[in-house]
């Protein structure tokens, strides 16, 4: 027989299958060109001295063989005596160590046994009922396929899975989705219903993120408020990168985790926009307001768990930057203007109460007045800061109020609302003898003292009821006692106390009468 032909004679070895565990297996035959065919197989066991023979039986019952020698691959043409248009049965017999080992048979029509392409181009990945769904366009003119997938994680070897039969212009596969680790998938195809047909190559890797994006483990710090009323938010710790399987390292489209920073400005609730989402790499400047900051991780399956921080308001106060004048028509605030065409947000809340009770007002964009001041006025009827209590006031400014990251703090200070003159009047004024010519005057702290920086001083007035002479004694706002000396025994005096703010003189307390008794010597 010629080596290029299938030999229709008995093979040159005895016909007996040893039934051993080793031997030829996994025979695959397919058409490689218009007139050529190839069969290949695996051989399990020691290969020294092994001779392989490809056996073929035609539908007529006639059988032949090709001698492959030690090779496990053999090519032949459509003129080799094997009928390519009709079904044939093929197997491999391996002669080794005086025994014959036989592979399982495959029955196929060689003409139509074409090696398929793997999924080409774009493989779409989506999530379906907790599983992964991959979908791709069937390679042209190769409809009708069996499809397999293999997948691995960074710490596990390849595992094989089956997609089932496909018979459409688009093919798809349901695969397991890992909760917390990235996976690499590859797909391959072969002709449907053709026993012994050859698998295609594996497709390019498809890199799939975990169902849950990793929770961002980051830390922030906030710098001090600068002269411009802004403070920088800085990232102390970058989010950890996702560990990827081998084939997804380097360029791994599909596994990307994006981290976004969501800012929620809690102060000044009357502004147009309270939240803003930024890329994590772009760290913003913030005003001195209170913020909630969330870092949101997301991948192609959507957002994951977020990590949230509270950034408290900067409570540094300006002692004199705010000027308040109270008139019959209402109250006006003045402060150094920031720039032309600025929108200001004035926020106030009673001291010692929950931050949720803050009230605010947004001004129309305004230019500085001739004195370089910005103003905000309100009438008594509006009820703004109308109660006689201490308010914490913060003023924010922005040239672009719709942009959350462009607000700055102008000032923070305290203000006593309502009729501060009357409300601040000290009560419980008492006089005690101190010496032969002096008394100690005590009083309960003014309500104004609950408002840091508001109470400028106390003034104690002493009036000699005989001579009508009046003396006034300034007292530090932290003191609630003063000693009046140089008094004369037997003379009637009245004493009063008032509490003054920087812009307002207080109302005198009720007059308190006293006298120093004349001492009679024995």
């Amino acid at each position: 027989c010629r080596t290029s032909e299938c030999c229709f004679q008995d093979p040159p070895y005895p016909d007996a299958d040893s039934g051993s565990a080793s031997g030829p297996r996994d025979l695959r035959c397919y058409r490689i060109s218009s007139d050529r065919y190839e069969c290949s197989w695996q051989y399990e066991g020691p290969t020294a001295g092994v001779s392989h023979f490809l056996r073929c039986c035609l539908s007529s019952g006639r059988c032949c063989y090709f001698a492959a020698g030690s090779a496990t691959r053999l090519q032949f043409s459509d003129q080799a005596g094997v009928s390519v248009l009709y079904t044939v049965t093929l197997w491999v017999e391996s002669w080794a160590r005086n025994q014959t080992e036989k592979s399982p048979e495959v029955t196929l029509q060689l003409y139509n046994s074409v090696k398929y392409e793997p999924p080409l181009g774009d493989i779409k990945v989506s999530k379906l009922a907790g599983q992964l769904r991959m979908e791709w366009e069937t390679p042209d003119n190769q409809v009708g396929a069996e499809v397999q997938f293999r997948h691995r994680t960074p710490s596990s070897p390849w595992k094989l899975g089956d997609c089932g039969p496909q018979d459409d212009d688009t093919e798809s596969c349901l695969c397991p989705l890992e909760m917390n680790v990235a996976q690499e998938f590859q797909l391959r195809r072969r002709q449907l219903g053709s026993q012994g047909s050859s698998w295609s190559k594996w497709s390019s890797p498809v890199c799939v993120p975990p169902e849950n994006p990793p929770q961002p483990q980051v830390r922030f710090s906030v710098e001090q408020l600068g002269q411009d009323g802004r403070r920088r938010l800085t990232l102390k710790e970058q989010p950890t990168q996702l560990e990827l399987p081998e084939g997804c390292q380097g360029l791994a489209p599909g596994t990307e985790v994006t981290y976004r920073l969501q800012l929620h400005m809690l102060s000044c609730p009357c502004k147009a926009k309270a939240t803003r989402t930024l890329h994590l790499g772009k760290m913003p400047y913030l005003s001195g307001a209170a913020y909630n900051v969330a870092v949101i991780s997301s991948n192609q399956f959507g957002p994951g768990l977020n990590q949230t921080w509270h950034i408290p308001a900067d409570t540094h106060t300006e002692p004199v930057a705010l000027n308040i004048s109270v008139g019959t028509n209402g109250t006006t605030m003045y402060w150094p203007a920031r720039a032309q065409s600025m929108t200001y947000c004035i926020e106030w809340q009673p001291v010692g109460q929950d931050g949720g009770l803050a009230t605010c007002s947004l001004t129309a964009p305004q230019d500085p007045d001739p004195a370089g001041m910005a103003t905000y006025s309100w009438s008594r009827e509006s009820g703004a800061m109308g109660q006689e209590k201490c308010y914490y006031i913060t003023i924010f400014a922005s040239a672009h109020p719709e942009k959350l990251t462009l607000w700055s703090t102008v000032l923070s200070t305290y203000h006593f609302g309502g009729n501060a003159s009357a409300a601040g009047t000290p009560h419980h004024v008492s006089v005690k003898n101190h010496s032969l010519d002096s008394v100690s005057v005590d009083w309960a702290p003014s309500l104004l003292s609950t408002c840091p920086g508001v109470l400028k001083e106390y003034v104690v007035r002493c009036r000699d009821e005989d001579s009508k002479q009046v003396s006034e004694h300034p007292v530090q706002p932290t003191e609630t006692q003063v000693t009046l000396s140089g008094l004369r025994a037997g003379v009637a005096y009245t004493v009063q106390v008032r509490a003054d703010t920087a812009w307002l003189r207080g109302v005198w307390s009720q007059p308190q009468r006293f006298s120093i008794e004349v001492q009679v010597s024995d």
């Epitope: 459509d78 042209d140 003119n141």
Partner: nanobody
């Protein structure tokens, strides 16, 4: 569904050449192979040749081998198959049909393996 339309038939001298075209439209990605058949009056359709579209593999009847060549061109949603006929003989006179099949089993030389057929184009070779 797949539609097939042949063109290019005509009258040609013995020894001459002719090129037939078959345009396939519709659900063309599902076609795995396209073939040419011919028929003369009172006879059955005879296999001429076939092309496996995804690979370009061809197969010819012995009577045309070496003279006829099948090729194909793919565009989006259309496939055109060509039959280049050289060294024509008077016995090549027939109506030429284009056919398409969607399954991988069966003998391509048999008409019943093909699901779709064109309307045919006449080729006449005169001496």
């Amino acid at each position: 569904e797949v539609q097939l339309v042949e063109s290019g038939g005509g009258l040609v001298q013995t020894g001459g050449s002719l090129r037939l075209s078959c345009a396939a439209s519709g659900r063309t990605p599902s076609i795995i192979a396209m073939g040419w058949f011919r028929q003369t009056p009172g006879k059955e359709r005879e296999f001429v040749g076939e092309i496996i579209l995804s690979k370009g593999f061809t197969y010819y009847a012995d009577s045309v081998k070496g003279r006829f060549t099948i090729s194909r061109a793919n565009a989006k949603n259309t496939i055109t198959m060509y039959l280049q006929m050289n060294s024509l003989k008077s016995e090549d006179t027939a109506v030429y049909y284009c056919a398409a099949r969607q399954n991988w089993s069966g003998n391509p030389t048999r008409t019943n393996e093909y699901e779709y057929w064109g309307q045919g184009t006449q080729v006449t070779v005169s001496s």
